[in-house]
């Protein structure tokens, strides 16, 4: 969590934003709060990206005004427009690129003063894994498949009975580039499953880590997936 | 309220250039993009392209060689250039504002202008 | 460039009826598909944008859904008036691509 004053000739108001990460060809959004103005007219909202001529995003006097939009920007941003009112200045970013990583600043102006926060947006790719009972191979084998992730992730596997045991031995994990040349798809195998265990397939990167369990039982099979992304703090 | 209104069609000789003008009301060409969409006789809806509020264009790589859409904010007008016309660039040619300035549909149309291409 | 397959192409229905227009994209285009109704002579008006979100003013019986590369246009209780062609429409990246339309006729 970044909070930031402004710190001009008039009152300095506080601007809440909040770190996050991106999956690429997805949306995103960009958070940032600040004291709300009763007035809509008299809010101004600048996003601007370190290392970019052009605006990210301006929203002013109830409306967007667009004409310093930086060209990366174009046609992909949006703020929630109904609710900047109620002090939210949060931007919608359309169809995530590598490229948008990087800190952003939300700066604001309202009758109260002038506020600004900055926002670390990291970019990547990240996916819930999915872990299935391969019945195609000769002993029993369990397969967990991810479709989109970047960078490289690491794979590790874990079981609830052989807690703290190492299973890279008698684990394969291969990584296939996607058709897009960016992100890539994980599948790793796990040979010589016991059942009556629960077994976790755990992926992570730098932007998000991922969990698929699966419990095999001789009646029966439960599967379940966790995602988490690993750099949401505040400023 | 929302207005566009799409003028300059009408007949054309093959090779020739076009030039058709939107002329905007009801909001500012500094907030939203304009797209410009033709439909051929019987035909589906074709995107060509789209000017956004900075000025800059985006092109339907099929047309880039012979279109060129800019604008005039202070006359809230956008202009539509498409050079060595041929027989099948007939068509309806329309003006269009996005819904949001995301781009997630086509919220308000001209009503069209008919350019026809024969000698 | 991505494809936007439209289907049927054209169906006959009657008033009353619940009507479904699908829309398969070619690649995943996450909710940027919009939907708009044609009447001869005249421009599309927007029906859904963003997948979902019905436009302003658009009657409650058009709804929208999908996400990814498949999409529904579903009209729950044919009116006299919607009968007209159908379009979908996607605005994720260049160029921009509709599908080929679906005619709506009376039976």
């Known amino acids: 969590l970044i909070i930031g004053f402004g710190i001009s000739g008039r009152h300095s108001i506080t601007v809440t934003t909040v770190a996050s990460a991106g999956n690429i060809g997805e949306d995103g959004i960009l958070s940032c709060t600040f004291e709300p103005d009763i007035k809509l007219s008299d809010i101004v909202i600048q996003w601007l990206k370190e290392g970019v001529l052009g605006l990210v995003h301006e929203f002013k006097e109830g409306k967007d005004e667009l004409s310093e939009q930086d060209e990366m920007f174009r046609g992909r941003t949006a703020v929630f427009a109904d609710q900047v009112i109620v002090g939210n200045a949060s931007l919608r970013l359309k169809n995530v690129q590598l490229t948008d990583a990087g800190t952003y600043k939300c700066y604001i102006i309202t009758s109260k003063g002038k506020g600004n926060a900055n926002l670390e947006y990291k970019t990547g790719a990240f996916s819930m894994p999915e872990v299935n009972v391969d019945y195609n191979a000769s002993s029993e084998t369990l397969r967990c498949e991810a479709p989109r992730w970047f960078p490289q992730p690491t794979v590790v596997w874990a079981s609830q009975v052989d807690q703290g045991a190492n299973f890279s031995e008698v684990s394969n994990t291969s990584f296939e580039l996607n058709s897009e040349n960016v992100t890539m798809k994980v599948v790793s195998v796990l040979y010589n499953v016991t059942i009556n265990n629960t077994y976790s397939c755990m992926i992570e990167n730098d932007i998000a880590k991922a969990t698929g369990d699966i419990k095999v039982t001789e009646s029966e099979i439960k599967r379940r997936s966790h995602l988490q992304l690993l750099n949401s703090k505040a400023s | 309220q929302v207005q566009l209104v799409e003028s300059g069609g009408g007949v054309v000789q093959p090779g020739r250039s076009l030039r058709l003008s939107c002329a905007v009301s009801?909001?500012?060409?500094?907030?939203?993009?304009v797209q410009w969409v033709r439909q051929a006789p019987g035909k589906g809806l074709e995107w060509l392209g789209v000017?956004?509020?900075?000025?800059?264009?985006d092109y339907n790589a099929a047309f880039l060689s012979r279109l060129t859409i800019s604008k005039d904010n202070s006359k809230n007008t956008v202009y539509f250039q498409m050079n060595s016309l041929r027989a099948e660039d007939t068509a309806v040619y329309y003006c269009?504002?996005?819904?949001?300035?995301?781009?997630?549909?086509?919220?308000?149309w001209g009503q069209g202008t008919l350019v026809t291409v024969s000698s | 460039d991505i494809q936007m397959t439209q289907s049927p192409s054209s169906l006959s229905a009657s008033v009353g009826d619940r009507v479904t227009i699908t829309c398969k994209a070619s690649?995943?285009?996450?909710?940027?598909v919009s939907w708009y109704q044609q009447k001869p002579g005249k421009a599309p008006k927007l029906l859904i944008y963003?997948?979902?979100n019905r436009y302003t003013g658009v009657p409650s019986r058009f709804s929208g859904s999908g996400s990814g590369t498949d999409f529904t246009l579903t009209i729950s209780s044919l009116q006299p008036e919607d009968f007209a062609t159908y379009y979908c429409?996607?605005?994720?990246?260049?160029?921009?691509?509709f599908g080929q339309g679906t005619k709506l006729e009376i039976k």
């Open positions: 269009a504002r996005d819904v949001t300035t995301i781009v997630e549909g086509f919220a308000h």
């Open positions: 009801g909001f500012s060409l500094t907030s939203y993009g």
């Open positions: 000017i956004w509020s900075s000025g800059s264009t």
């Open positions: 690649e995943k285009v996450g909710t940027y």
């Open positions: 963003g997948a979902s």
């Open positions: 429409g996607q605005t994720y990246s260049y160029p921009f691509t």
